[in-house]
Interface confidence: medium
C-alpha cells in the first residue's frame, strides 16, 4: 500500500511535470510566438484512456516529437532554455511516476492534435491525478 | 519508394462536376499533410489548400476556400479535390503533394513528394 | 496574405555561370522558405527548405540563404538541365504562398 510519504513524493513530482508542461504550453500560447501557425500543424498522438500513472506511457512514447518540434520552433519571441534538457527531465519523471514493474502498450485514440490540444490533455491528467491524491 | 499518383486527365463542361484523386504509396499516409496546387496554362503555382488524412483536418487559401472541397480517405490513401460546378477558369493542371515531415509525421517543410498532375480542361 | 515576389522574371545565362534569383516577402517570415525547380511540362522538384537546406540528392550547385524578408537562391555552375522556372514559397503562415517564378535559359 502506498505510504504517506511516497504519495507526497508521486503528488510532487506531479506537480513539477505539471509546471514543466505549463511552462511549454505558456510559450506556445504567447500571442507573439511567430511559430505557432507552423506548430499547428504537427500532429500529436492522444491517449485512448488516460486516468492512471501507468498510462504516462502514452506521454513517454510522445516526447521525442515534442522535443523536435520544439526545437523547430524556437525564436527570438519563444524561447525554451534548453529543450533537450526540459524534454530530459519531464522523461525522467516520467519514468518514475509510471513505474517499470509494468510494459503497458499504449492505446492511441484515432483522431490526432495539436501540439495545445496535447498539452492541455496531459495537463488535465496531471491535475486530476493531484487532485485524487490531496 | 515514396509516391503519389494522380488520376487522368479531364475534359468537361461548364457546370459539370469533378473529382479528381491523389494516392499515396511508400509512406504511412495518415502521417502527412496533402496539398493541392493549381497551375494555370503558362502561369505559377498557386498554393489551394491541404488535408491531414489522419483526422481530415483540411485548411483552404481564401482564394480556394467555397470554390472545391478538399477530402481524403485514409483507408485507400487517397486524397481528393473535387467541384460542384465547374468553370471554364478552372482550366489548369492540378498537382498533389506531400508535407515533408520529422518524426515520421508532417511537420510543414515544404512539398518534397509531388504527383504528376491531373490536367482538368472546361469547355463548352 | 503574405505575397512573395522574385525577381528577375527570367534570365539568360552561359554555363558555367554564376546565377542568382531574389525573393521578397512582404513580412518577415523567418526562415521559412522554400525552393522548387520546375521543368517544362513537369511536375515542380522540391530543392531547399528553411532558406538554406538542401533537399536529399539535390547537387550541391544549388543553395539558398537568406531570412526575414529577403531570399536568394543561387546556381554557382549553371548546366544545361539547369534549364527551368524556379519558384519560392513561403510555408510560415497560411495560406502558403508561392513567387511568381523565374525563368532561366541557357545563352
Known amino acids: 500500500a502506498p505510504t504517506s510519504s511516497s504519495t507526497k513524493k508521486t503528488q510532487l513530482q506531479l506537480e513539477h511535470l505539471l509546471l514543466d508542461l505549463q511552462m511549454i504550453l505558456n510559450g506556445i500560447n504567447n500571442y507573439k510566438n511567430p511559430k505557432l501557425t507552423r506548430m499547428l500543424t504537427f500532429k500529436f498522438y492522444m491517449p485512448k484512456k488516460a486516468t492512471e500513472l501507468r498510462h504516462l506511457q502514452c506521454l513517454e512514447e510522445e516526447l521525442k516529437p515534442l522535443e523536435e518540434v520544439l526545437n523547430l520552433a524556437q525564436s527570438k519571441s519563444f524561447h525554451l532554455r534548453d529543450t533537450k534538457d526540459l524534454i530530459s527531465n519531464i522523461n525522467v519523471i516520467v519514468l518514475e511516476l509510471k513505474g517499470s514493474e509494468t510494459t503497458l502498450m499504449c492505446e492511441y485514440a484515432d483522431e490526432t492534435a495539436t501540439i495545445v490540444e496535447f498539452l492541455n490533455r496531459w495537463i488535465t491528467f496531471c491535475q486530476s491525478i493531484i487532485s485524487t491524491l490531496t | 519508394e515514396v509516391q503519389l499518383v494522380q488520376s487522368g486527365a479531364e475534359v468537361k463542361k461548364p457546370g459539370e462536376s469533378l473529382k479528381i484523386s491523389c494516392k499515396g504509396s511508400?509512406?504511412?499516409?495518415?502521417?502527412?499533410?496533402i496539398g493541392w496546387v493549381r497551375q494555370m496554362p503558362g502561369k505559377g503555382l498557386e498554393w489551394m489548400g491541404i488535408?491531414?488524412?489522419?483526422?481530415?483536418?483540411?485548411k483552404y487559401s481564401p482564394s480556394f476556400q467555397g470554390q472545391v472541397t478538399i477530402s481524403a480517405d485514409k483507408s485507400i490513401s487517397t486524397a481528393y479535390l473535387q467541384w460542384s460546378s465547374l468553370k471554364a477558369s478552372d482550366t489548369a493542371m492540378y498537382y498533389c503533394?506531400?508535407?515533408?515531415?520529422?518524426?515520421?509525421?508532417?511537420?510543414?517543410?515544404?512539398?518534397?513528394?509531388w504527383g504528376q498532375g491531373t490536367a482538368v480542361t472546361v469547355s463548352s | 496574405d503574405i505575397q512573395m515576389t522574385q525577381s528577375p522574371s527570367s534570365l539568360s545565362a552561359s554555363v558555367g555561370d554564376r546565377v542568382t534569383i531574389t525573393c521578397q516577402a512582404s513580412?518577415?517570415?523567418?526562415?521559412?522558405l522554400n525552393w522548387y525547380q520546375q521543368k517544362p511540362g513537369k511536375a515542380p522538384k522540391f530543392l531547399i527548405y528553411?532558406?538554406?537546406n538542401l533537399e536529399t540528392g539535390v547537387p550541391s550547385r544549388f543553395s539558398g540563404s537568406g531570412s526575414g524578408t529577403d531570399f536568394f537562391f543561387t546556381i554557382s555552375n549553371l548546366q544545361p538541365e539547369d534549364i527551368a522556372t524556379y519558384f519560392c514559397?513561403?510555408?510560415?503562415?497560411?495560406?502558403?504562398?508561392f513567387g511568381p517564378g523565374t525563368k532561366v535559359d541557357i545563352k
Open positions: 503533394a506531400r508535407h515533408g515531415g520529422y518524426s515520421g509525421r508532417s511537420y510543414y517543410y515544404g512539398m518534397d513528394v
Open positions: 511508400g509512406y504511412r499516409f495518415t502521417n502527412y499533410w
Open positions: 488535408i491531414y488524412p489522419g483526422d481530415s483536418d483540411t
Open positions: 513580412q518577415d517570415i523567418s526562415n521559412y
Open positions: 528553411d532558406a538554406s
Open positions: 514559397q513561403q510555408d510560415d503562415n497560411l495560406p502558403f504562398t
